[in-house]
């Protein structure tokens, strides 16, 4: 019962985590304009992995997709790759874990096979979570570096009269969503791995017991019961479901209305 609960909870936690990773990847607020010097701005900038946006006081938001691959910073490309790998692994992990759930019966699937699939999905969730955390952390590090670089030369005077204020960017909501989602996926993966241990039946050898009956002697000797944990040589070849995630660059979005000033 505890094993089923652990496995089920691990699945749900991972499902929430992967949904969060997908949400974070799609969000536009990976970096937002730092408002420390100007808390109320008439023009507000924010950027995502796929496009950058400008929100005006008028309520209009204009977003422009990054229509180049080669012109983008290598770090941004790396973050994109990490997030996509995280999503793909997570999606495959979810598919595998659905079939591995103890509460779902599929034909005459042995517990050993379920244990094997549970471990596989658990490892996938752990790697998926780590990919998301790594991606978000790389982006955060990039922001911190750029923030201090732009702070160093924030005001460039033109003859001492005109000031050009450089736009600084700080952490956006997507970073926090990504960190939490990655953490949840990781926790879910660990729970699946723990559940796997409980699912795998222990190797049990019963000692032979002799019963001496009057008249004739009969010996009941149950054979040594040996269940495969799924790691031995007698594993059945199961095809692990393969899924893929495909991303497309965002289409140019026309200015849309926003519901705040």
């Amino acid at each position: 019962m505890a094993v089923t609960a652990c496995q089920g909870l691990g699945f749900v936690v991972s499902l929430i985590g992967i949904a969060g990773i997908i949400a974070a990847t799609c969000m536009d607020q990976w970096s937002t304009q730092d408002l420390y010097n100007n808390p109320v701005t008439a023009v507000f900038n924010y950027q995502g992995l796929w496009r950058s946006c400008v929100r005006e006081s008028s309520g209009f938001t204009e977003c422009r997709g990054y229509f180049t691959l080669l012109g983008l910073p290598a770090m941004l490309q790396a973050v994109r790759a990490l997030m996509i790998v995280g999503i793909v692994l997570g999606a495959i992990g979810l598919l595998v874990s659905i079939f591995a759930l103890k509460c779902i019966r599929i034909g005459s699937m042995e517990d050993s096979a379920k244990a094997n699939m549970t471990l596989t999905s658990g490892i996938m969730f752990i790697v998926s979570g780590l990919c998301a955390i790594a991606g978000v952390s790389v982006f955060a590090n990039m922001l911190v570096t750029n923030f201090w670089m732009s702070t160093a030369n924030m005001y460039t005077g033109m003859g001492g009269m005109v000031q050009t204020v450089q736009t600084r960017y700080t952490f956006g909501a997507a970073l926090f969503v990504g960190w939490v989602a990655g953490g949840l996926t990781l926790i879910g993966g660990v729970m699946m791995c723990i559940a796997c241990r409980g699912l795998a039946p222990e190797e049990t050898n019963y000692k032979a017991v002799s019963y001496h009956a009057s008249g004739h002697s009969v010996a009941y000797k149950p054979g040594g019961f040996k269940a495969s944990t799924g790691f031995g040589s007698n594993t059945k070849n199961k095809k692990i479901y393969d899924g893929g995630a495909r991303t497309e660059d965002e289409v140019q979005s026309y200015p849309s209305k926003h519901d705040y000033v």
């Epitope: 023009v43 950027q47 950058s52 008028s58 309520g59 209009f60 204009e62 005109v162 736009t167 000033v261």
Partner: antibody, heavy 118, light 113 residues
Framework: EVQLQQSGAEVKKPGASVKVSCKAS????????MNWVKQAPGQGLEWIGL????????SYNQKFQGKATLTVDKSSSTAYMELSRLRSEDSAVYYC???????????WGAGTTVTVPS | DIVMTQSPDSLAVSLGERATINCKSS????????????LTWYQQKPGQPPKLLIY???TRESGVPDRFSGSGSGTDFTLTISSLQAEDVAVYYC?????????FGAGTKLELK
């Protein structure tokens, strides 16, 4: 056709308050930010503040903070500006203006003249 | 606050001639996010509310004659009327739309010579 219809001219005593209205028609009232601009006799334009009719969010020019209060009534598609503790220097024409792309004010009301005798 | 300085204060131009009004801001109005300059030009005739001519420094509002054009970037901007018509006699204002408080220039009075 987009129209911003402002209330009539007002003459108020010093220390009193006045509430100027701006009724919008011909467009989605909650979809555009409304601005208020002051023009003293023979003077230039001065931005008072803005209000987002969708959520009531406001931004004021510090100079008019405490002097002007911006509100909206979504049901009647009307924006209001209340000026408190009136003084002679508050005598001016007050315009409401709809904000569009580029934060530009594309449609303006005809203006409401507020007179505060000294 | 961003200070908008217009020059000249007044300008007399003959019909059909070119009129140029300058506007200088104390801070850059160029937004790095979309590479647009948040500067707007208005025309105001006596007894009338202002009328939008140009936004984003160079984008002409629909219905505005193409003799009106805006140019410039950062801190220096120009409104040009290529061939002055009698109905163009008015006061012209530039406005900072980039940073609160939104600020206007003092205005340039355009008259017929």
């Amino acid at each position: 056709e987009v129209q911003l219809q402002q209330s009539g001219a007002e003459v108020k005593k010093p220390g009193a308050s006045v509430k100027v209205s701006c009724k919008a028609s011909g467009y989605s009232f909650t979809g555009y930010t409304m601005n208020w601009v002051k023009q003293a006799p023979g003077q230039g334009l001065e931005w008072i503040g803005l209000i987002n009719p969708y959520n009531g969010g406001t931004s004021y020019n510090q100079k008019f903070q405490g002097k002007a209060t911006l509100t909206v009534d979504k049901s009647s598609s009307t924006a209001y500006m209340e000026l408190s503790r009136l003084r002679s220097e508050d005598s001016a024409v007050y315009y409401c203006a709809r904000m569009n792309y580029g934060n530009a004010m594309d449609y303006w009301g005809a203006g409401t003249t507020v007179t505060v005798p000294s | 606050d961003i200070v908008m300085t217009q020059s000249p204060d007044s300008l007399a131009v003959s019909l059909g001639e070119r009129a140029t009004i300058n506007c200088k801001s104390s801070q850059s109005l160029l937004n790095s996010g979309n590479q647009k300059n948040y500067l707007t030009w208005y025309q105001q005739k006596p007894g009338q509310p202002p009328k939008l001519l140009i936004y984003w420094a160079s984008t002409r509002e629909s219905g505005v004659p193409d003799r009106f054009s805006g140019s410039g970037s950062g801190t220096d901007f120009t409104l040009t009327i290529s061939s002055l018509q009698a109905e163009d006699v008015a006061v012209y204002y530039c406005q900072n739309d980039y940073s609160y408080p939104l600020t206007f220039g003092a205005g340039t009075k355009l008259e017929l010579k």
